[in-house]
Amino acid sequence: QEDEDGDYEELVLALRSEEDGLAEAPEHGTTATFHRCAKDPWRLPGTYVVVLKEETHLSQSERTARRLQAQAARRGYLTKILHVFHGLLPGFLVKMSGDLLELALKLPHVDYIEEDSSVFAQSIPWNLERITPPRYRADEYQPPDGGSLVEVYLLDTSIQSDHREIEGRVMVTDFENVPEEDGTRFHRQASKCDSHGTHLAGVVSGRDAGVAKGASMRSLRVLNCQGKGTVSGTLIGLEFIRKSQLVQPVGPLVVLLPLAGGYSRVLNAACQRLARAGVVLVTAAGNFRDDACLYSPASAPEVITVGATNAQDQPVTLGTLGTNFGRCVDLFAPGEDIIGASSDCSTCFVSQSGTSQAAAHVAGIAAMMLSAEPELTLAELRQRLIHFSAKDVINEAWFPEDQRVLTPNLVAALPPSTHGAGWQLFCRTVWSAHSGPTRMATAVARCAPDEELLSCSSFSRSGKRRGERMEAQGGKLVCRAHNAFGGEGVYAIARCCLLPQANCSVHTAPPAEASMGTRVHCHQQGHVLTGCSSHWEVEDLGTHKPPVLRPRGQPNQCVGHREASIHASCCHAPGLECKVKEHGIPAPQEQVTVACEEGWTLTGCSALPGTSHVLGAYAVDNTCVVRSRDVSTTGSTSEGAVTAVAICCRSRHLAQASQELQ
């Protein structure tokens, strides 16, 4: 999902800006930055979240806020501190003139400031409700465990908690932080105010139309009667959850955020902090038929972001728009004509559509999985959600062409049994943001903190790239792809796996002098090869073909072009075994694939040879895909021959551990 330096408007207020009337840069240390929503109508100028540096204490936050007020007063400006944050992010929410931003950015401890902006419920119809009875037989769906050990927090509108579908299942907290409704003639009708939240609570835990019928819920009101809220209100809600968790630790927590606003650094940061405190966050991808990475909290990497599909597993169209898509989406779930509790009456049902409904499905599935296995980490849960999803059922033609390869073709499903998946080696594919077209541009893909990067590949639509390499960053391996001169940009593709007690390292061989090609192998005892990468400095690799792809008896070896440096990912983990599988096609072809067989998991995917007509390699579920330039442009020379190389692994240790449990 979105990198921290996300694609949104960032104003570094170091130089004078005419628009905001700003002066010189801060005196000390690094420059604090100002951020605002890229979508102008959603901006809320006059209210700002001042985020302080990570280690700032509450007393320092309060002091900084008072200092801002005092300095503003000296300049004749009134300010109001609306909230002081602590527990999740240090900082404060302030109502003030934009003229004071320059002053605020110079305050001690300030990391960045973000202008407040709107967030919105992600369902339609908002008030065109159809009252319908549940359209199924209840005994068709009776899950083994209804999520009874899990608490699901819902940040949404007010809800009708005594609706027959959810009575006794939802505790309405006293938390409320919503903006005034728009329009002077707005009539606040209770049933409409409750519509969105009631429906979603029903989808998660409703007695008859719910996914996790045993889950208990707590609701926080962050959206008003028009389904509109603010980033700041959502932040304060997330902080409330964190404080509740600290005061009274319970079992696993799932937080459902069925809302979306423009990209927000601060909202994403808060989600990251809460996720790292052990909370599972599930959010709507957004209903804008757009790249989910442009929205928050959808773009937060730690959040499980859900797009919407219909009964035919096709992406949901919502009026002129539809579900969001792209690399920031983790998976899709049912989100069209979803039956759930209607706030029109205490026994009414209604169908609503949107990525909110899809996210509610996944929150319900997550609650059931966590109830069955309460010790699951966020990374383990995400991997299981992906693993048990229906694969390759979505018609990708609905997505823009450039987004198809980035969008996961996964529709959420309940596991056949909520237990017994522990023996599996789980892996997922993580795409980076696009590098951009400059000559030295790079793109970085990262795994979650408790995942292992087992391989790294790259992809460029133009084919102009300089490969990829695994490198250490902050004590963790990342996957970096390199653009080439004249290239339109590259993607880095990380293969991120759950491998307990793993010890992985990267072995590099520099470009070979001889014509034999470059090779590198895993020489440490007990280490197996999980992935191969190659990176080159020359603009265009020649047509050199390694004479021998892989000498017999040396499966732990990466081979590549003589002008490229080759990187082998070598891992030691209990019971880990891997094998190399190749599929070569002598004639030129736009796509070559090779898949791992049942019981084995794809950890590495690369192409041989690494010549410039190869666009790149990437993993889709358990299949390694190598893409080449259009055959009409390469002709049918031997250069067109491409081999897809998959590295397939399994863990005997995990399998044994699982058998001992059963």
Epitope: A138, E167, M171, V172, R207
Partner: antibody, heavy 115, light 109 residues
Framework: QVQLVQSGAEVKKPGASVKVSCKAS????????ISWVRQAPGQGLEWMGW????????NYAQKLQGRGTMTTDPSTSTAYMELRSLRSDDTAVYYC????????WGQGTTVTVSS | QSALTQPASVSGSPGQSITISCTGT?????????VSWYQQHPGKAPKLMIY???NRPSGVSNRFSGSKSGNTASLTISGLQAEDEADYYC?????????FGGGTKLTVL
Amino acid sequence: QVQLVQSGAEVKKPGASVKVSCKASGYTLTSYGISWVRQAPGQGLEWMGWVSFYNGNTNYAQKLQGRGTMTTDPSTSTAYMELRSLRSDDTAVYYCARGYGMDVWGQGTTVTVSS
Amino acid sequence: QSALTQPASVSGSPGQSITISCTGTSSDVGGYNSVSWYQQHPGKAPKLMIYEVSNRPSGVSNRFSGSKSGNTASLTISGLQAEDEADYYCNSYTSTSMVFGGGTKLTVL
């Protein structure tokens, strides 16, 4: 603990009205409505309707439409059931119960309609 | 709304198991997960024994169990005891209301 306490027995003449109260305690009021159920002597249970503490909404059994009114007063945590134009076949024990799930019941209020 | 159909009476000896059936339609029992069973001793208020087809509230003996197949729900009491002698009522959601069964008198011989 969760409790529903009902008002005392009533004796009414045919054509009169009766108003039975039910005071709730020990739980979050707005998470549940109140169901009203009656039981005529020697007969089974009959669901009469439901009323919300959250917004005052009601859901009446068809048989009761027009003759009964259910209300709540959240400030006193009390639900009320009023039955008008009483007939002798309204003689019964009237129970309030928590929500549609009816997991907790009041002790019952005997209403006798007799001339 | 017509009442759900229950046998008027069932009996069993101490230690035995008995089952009480509750038959409705696809618009009530068959259409919802919300079938409940209540026990009522003479002169007392009903007590919830089973909710949502097969769940037992805390404090209710595990000798009581519930199930459902199609439009018929069942209450099974195993290891029958003298104190189990009472009237038993089933209850189900309908699309807009609630409906009870006519009741079953359980006699422990």
